[in-house]
């Protein structure tokens, strides 16, 4: 007789998953030589250990603690970039301004980014066919917990001047709900941060409206004012030729705004 | 029917090396990963490491770090073990077992073991 | 390390007994357990695993139970047969380790 088991409404855990995460670990520490030391079986260890067997909606901040202490990374404080929304420019960014870093850059972001995993309480089956969603079945399930752990640590890491891309083609440029609006806003240090600097991204080609007064971003320079840090803001024009210009600097076409 | 065979009984001087062999069958050599663990003498069993042939990385208790090579031959569907500077406490009956990649279950085979004897 | 600790480290009993072993973790472990059974001159058997769930063929007379640090493999019936040393192991974390074996023999 089959088990019944839990329907949830999101995927299931991502094919191959632990063969993924392994894979993305022997692969990070092979290019990261200060990662080197990381055994990658013992991170699998930690990973399985905060969500296997566990009911997949009571998932604590607790539960990765092991596999947070194994990811222990060093990045340098001040070359932080924030996302929210726009997660494929970020990344295109940090590939080629290698001195800068998104939280998927680092061991932990990497393994986990655009994966989804979940087990079920009482047995030490991974899930395959069906995970909690966030709004439709509960917000402490393994993938959001997980990602609100590591964006928590990496903000709190964050000081000096601090960047965040936000996407201008959205409705709400800054979203309180979002990972960045609901956590990493709360959680960068005053006394080490100076500066959050965001860069609004615009779509379209024609579009030059000052997307720095939209309503939104004044809630966030509100947020941020009252966290006794100061607020900058710069409008990206041109996403294709911001990145043009971080490639190539010395480009003539670089002096003028993008 | 899964098998894991290993290779034959070894004896061995203090401070020379040891390779010895377990050969997978009936089962899909990389969807698994294979450890090593030995039995001294009337004594229990003792963890050495872990590999996986799929992606090719291994790991080890510390206390045969620098002495344990663990690895494996896809082609031929073999894990090897091999240790260097023998002892006499290395006296040992060595067992390979398998294990899914994921660690989710217990080492479900094991081979038939493989005694060395190390004496001058 | 997590240390694994077995008692008793031999007993008696006579067939139709009841037999308890129990195994305790250094630290917590959740239900990365296994329970092994070995004879003279063989390899181990697997014989629980996840602390409670039966290898595929083991007979249903065994049994496993706990979590956490605190394990108990049972045999409810003891047969013949299952006179051998029993192992528990931890899965948890690296490097696996093992209890030091209890030695089940004929009273």
């Known amino acids: 007789v089959p088990r019944w088991r839990q329907q949830w409404s999101g995927p299931g855990t991502t094919k191959r998953f632990p063969e993924t995460v392994l894979a993305r670990c022997v692969k990070y520490t092979e290019i990261h030589p200060e990662m080197r030391h990381v055994d990658c079986q013992s991170v699998w260890d930690a990973f399985k250990g905060a969500f296997i067997s566990k009911h997949p909606c009571n998932i604590t901040e607790e539960d990765y603690q092991p596999l947070m202490k194994l990811g222990t990374q060093t990045v340098p404080c001040n070359k932080i970039l924030l996302w929210s929304r726009i997660k494929d420019l970020a990344h295109q960014f940090t590939q080629v301004q290698r001195d800068m870093f998104t939280l998927e850059d680092t061991l932990l972001g990497y393994l986990a980014d655009d994966l989804t995993w979940c087990g079920e309480f009482n047995t030490s089956k991974i899930n395959y066919q069906s995970c909690p969603d966030w709004r439709k079945d509960c917000s402490n399930n393994p993938v959001s917990v997980f990602w609100k752990t590591v964006s928590r640590r990496f903000a709190e890491a964050a000081c000096d001047v601090v960047h965040v891309m936000l996407n201008g083609s959205r409705s709400k440029i800054f979203d309180k709900n979002s990972t960045f609006g609901s956590v990493e806003v709360h959680n960068l240090q005053p006394e080490k941060v100076q500066t959050l600097e965001a860069w609004v991204i615009h779509g379209g080609r024609e579009d030059s409206r000052d997307l720095c007064q939209d309503p939104t971003i004044k809630e966030l320079e509100s947020i941020i004012s009252k966290r006794n840090i100061q607020f900058s803001c710069k409008n990206i024009y041109r996403p294709d030729k911001f990145l043009q210009c971080v490639k190539n600097p010395e480009d003539s076409s670089c002096t003028s705004e993008i | 029917q899964v098998q894991l065979v290993q290779s034959g009984a070894e004896v061995k001087k203090p401070g020379s090396s040891v390779k010895v062999s377990c050969k997978a069958s009936?089962?899909?050599?990389?969807?698994?990963?294979f450890s090593w663990v030995r039995q001294a003498p009337g004594q229990g069993l003792e963890w050495m490491g872990r590999?996986?042939?799929?992606?090719?990385?291994?790991n080890s208790a510390q206390k045969f770090q620098g002495r344990v090579t663990i690895t494996a031959d896809k082609s031929t569907s073999t894990a090897y073990m091999d240790l260097s500077s023998l002892r006499s406490e290395d006296t040992a009956v060595y067992y390979c077992?398998?294990?899914?990649?994921?660690?989710?279950?217990?080492?479900?085979?094991w081979g038939q073991g493989t005694l060395v004897t190390v004496s001058s | 390390d997590i240390q694994m600790t077995q008692s008793p480290s031999s007993l008696s009993a006579s067939v139709g007994d009841r037999v308890t072993i129990t195994c305790r973790a250094s630290q917590g472990i959740s239900s990365w357990l296994a329970w092994y059974q070995q004879k003279p001159e063989k390899a181990p058997k697997s014989l629980i695993y996840a602390a409670s769930s039966l290898q595929s063929g083991v007979p249903s007379r065994f049994s496993g139970s706990g979590s956490g640090t605190d394990f108990t493999l049972t045999i409810s019936s003891l047969q013949p047969e299952d006179f051998a040393t029993y192992y528990c192991?931890?899965?948890?974390?690296?490097?696996?380790?093992f209890g030091q074996g209890t030695k089940v023999e004929i009273k």
């Open positions: 192991q931890q899965y948890n974390s690296y490097p696996r380790t």
């Open positions: 590999v996986i042939p799929q992606l090719g990385i291994a």
């Open positions: 009936g089962g899909t050599f990389s969807s698994y990963a």
């Open positions: 077992a398998r294990d899914d990649i994921a660690a989710l279950g217990p080492f479900d085979y």
